[in-house]
């Protein structure tokens, strides 16, 4: 019996036309939502003038439906048993699942001012930037709508730069009508234990963002894993959102709509400093902000963002060192709300429920030559927003899963 089930599973999780896995893989049958909470800055003037702690108040959720588009350019390669594809991006606002509209206003860090002052360190260039910032009446903080902040707006300061620069700024700009990839993953035909594992991303086996093993593209994209998952396994996956591979470890058995699943979580160790977790040494890319690589819980992904000083963390700086959150008031991290987990059906390796949580932060530093940053006495890693991307298998699919997979085994 067991061998027959194993054989059936192995056959059905292969990523090729006609299998259950392939159908759900090309276009997810699960509704995926991305909820945003924006950190509204309450004291912009005090911060700018006196270098006070930044007082933030989260506002949300603002919910979008995402990942509803089928994979594109799906191409099988029989020679190396891989399938390549593009994952198109799309987001549809869901008013009924949101606390307000896309036109709601927020006081947030001026993304262009913070980024430009970081990218252009030369003092003379900063003086040029300063005159353009003043001319455009820009400041350290700005008021933007949700739509502008997420999907892009024409920045008045960048619009004055007299040589070609991208004048549109947004945390997720460009998003709609773009695609992530090309991904090339193993289809499992020759070796089921490699199914869904990424072979190359954008034509490469490495990212070129990090040194050593940190630069590797490991595991799957977390939507599924090779079948017959063990609790002792460390599940590796790659997330283009955070420009790195990461891993999850078993936490607990969970019953999801009658289906026994394993809950895997991202452990605090994955966010630790190299002092506590030596494997993380290559995620420490500079010595000043990281206090000689002793800070933890924030990841500098500037190399992946054209030099813009973007730092990724868990929401509310969960698992981050006290020095990171010290200059920010109004944060309340808790594991239940702010950690990432994957609920994996162990026989098939399918992720039937997940919650991916992350926070987007921007570094802003004092600048002698930029008036609006002149009074700052310290560096700030400023939280802009955090997101919760969730998906849960639908009732109908769960019934089908119970009857065709778990029911047959039990």
């Amino acid at each position: 019996g067991d061998l027959l089930i194993q054989k059936t599973i192995k056959k059905q999780v292969v990523l090729e036309e006609g299998t259950i896995a392939f159908k759900n893989w090309v276009k997810t049958g699960t509704e995926v939502y991305r909820q945003f909470w924006i950190f509204d800055v309450q004291n912009p003037q005090e911060v700018m003038m006196n270098s006070s702690n930044i007082q933030v108040k989260q506002r949300g959720p603002y919910t979008y439906r995402v990942r509803f588009l089928a994979k594109e350019n799906v191409t099988q390669d029989a020679e190396d048993n891989t399938v390549s594809f593009l994952q198109p991006n799309g987001a549809i606002f869901e008013p009924s699942l949101s606390v307000g509209t896309e036109a709601d206003n927020f006081t947030v860090l001026n993304l262009a001012v913070a980024a430009a002052s970081h990218i252009y360190q030369n003092q003379f260039v900063q003086m040029i930037l300063n005159s353009l910032i003043n001319k455009s009446k820009s400041s350290m903080f700005q008021v933007r709508t949700l739509r502008e902040l997420l999907w892009g707006y024409r920045d008045p300061f960048l619009s004055l730069v007299p040589y070609p620069v991208t004048t549109t700024v947004g945390l997720f700009y460009p998003y709609n009508n773009t695609a992530d990839g090309v991904y090339k993953v193993f289809n499992g035909k020759d070796n089921i234990s490699k199914v869904a594992i990424i072979d190359t991303y954008k034509g490469k086996r490495n990212l070129s963002y990090w040194e050593s093993h940190c630069d590797m593209i490991n595991g799957t994209d977390a939507a599924s894993f090779p079948p017959f998952v063990e609790k002792s396994q460390v599940l590796q996956f790659f997330s283009s959102d955070i420009c790195r591979s990461i891993y999850a470890v078993f936490e607990s058995d969970v019953n999801l709509k009658g289906i026994p699943v394993y809950r895997f979580v991202l452990p605090s160790k994955a966010f630790a400093s190299p002092v506590e977790n030596p494997d993380n040494y290559c995620f420490c890319t500079e010595k000043i902000i990281s206090k000689n690589c002793t800070s933890y819980g924030v990841l500098d992904i500037s190399k992946c963002k054209e030099g813009r000083p973007v730092y990724i963390s868990l929401p509310h700086f969960l698992y981050a060192s006290p020095d990171v959150s010290e200059p920010i008031d109004g944060l309340n991290p808790n594991e239940e709300e702010h950690r990432t987990y994957l609920d994996i059906e162990p026989i098939t390796g399918f992720t039937l429920q997940f919650a991916k949580r992350l926070q987007v932060n921007l570094l802003v530093k004092p600048s002698e030559k930029i008036q609006v940053l002149k009074n700052l006495k310290r560096n700030y890693i400023v939280p802009i927003l955090w997101l919760n991307e969730t998906g849960t298998i639908g009732d109908e699919k769960a019934n089908m899963f119970r009857s065709q997979v778990t029911g047959k085994i039990n």
């Epitope: 003379f124 005159s131 007299p162 002698e368 030559k369």
Partner: antibody, heavy 115, light 107 residues
């Protein structure tokens, strides 16, 4: 050692243009911006503008805006200052000088505007 | 635009004397003031840069002080070779602006 060597003296007619060159050596050219300063006979110093060869960032003094053009050629480590629509008041020694604090100076180029 | 008012325009001193030159700016420029010496037929020479920093190789009899809008340049124990024009320059903001200059004559 750092050296800035400027092109030779020029005599120009009113309404014409002049282009002064400044060849840098002894340091990595694109590491520092090049500033231009002029000094009319018996007068003080006047900042004209500056260029950052690395980014192409340029700033001009309002007085010279539209009449002066600063360029930099990284391949030859040379900065250029072109001043157009010359008038007699433009008769001056033109200096290139490095960085915001003007730490090294060229020897100066005398431009005489006379009909 | 930050205007820089330098005074006096002319001063005369005897070797061994101490002289001071003042530069006052129309806006707060922190300590972004620089001081230059220029002798006839030569380009200016940087003596003191931002933050009242004496340049390497410049004799210690030259010094400066000041922050914000009021700046002072001092030569202690003047020597005959110090006869020259002296200029201040603010490098805090654009456009960069010079003082009008001070001619120092040694009697």
């Amino acid at each position: 050692q750092v050296q800035l060597v400027q092109s030779g003296a020029e005599v120009k007619k009113p309404g014409s243009s002049v282009k002064v060159s400044c060849k840098a050596s002894g340091y990595r050219f694109s590491d520092y911006e090049m500033q231009w300063v002029r000094q009319a006979p018996g007068q003080g110093l006047e900042w004209m503008g500056g260029i950052d060869p690395e980014t192409g960032g340029i700033a001009y003094a309002q007085k010279f805006q539209g009449r002066v053009t600063l360029t930099a050629d990284k391949s030859t480590s040379t900065a250029y200052m072109e001043l157009s629509s010359l008038r007699s008041e433009d008769t001056a020694v033109y200096y290139c000088t490095r960085k915001l604090d003007f730490d090294y100076w060229g020897q100066g180029t005398l431009v005489t505007v006379s009909s | 635009e930050t205007t820089v008012t330098q005074s006096p325009a002319f001063m005369s001193a005897t070797t061994g004397d101490k002289v001071t030159i003042s530069c006052i700016t129309s806006t707060d420029i922190d300590d972004d003031m620089n001081w230059y010496q220029q002798k006839p037929g030569e380009p200016p020479k940087l003596l003191i840069s931002e933050g009242n920093t004496l340049r390497p190789g410049v004799p210690s009899r030259f010094s400066s002080s000041g922050y914000g809008t009021d700046f002072t340049f001092t030569i202690n124990n003047i020597e005959s070779e110090d006869a020259a024009y002296y200029y201040c320059l603010q490098s805090d903001n654009l456009p960069l602006t010079f003082g009008q200059g001070t001619k120092l004559e040694i009697k």
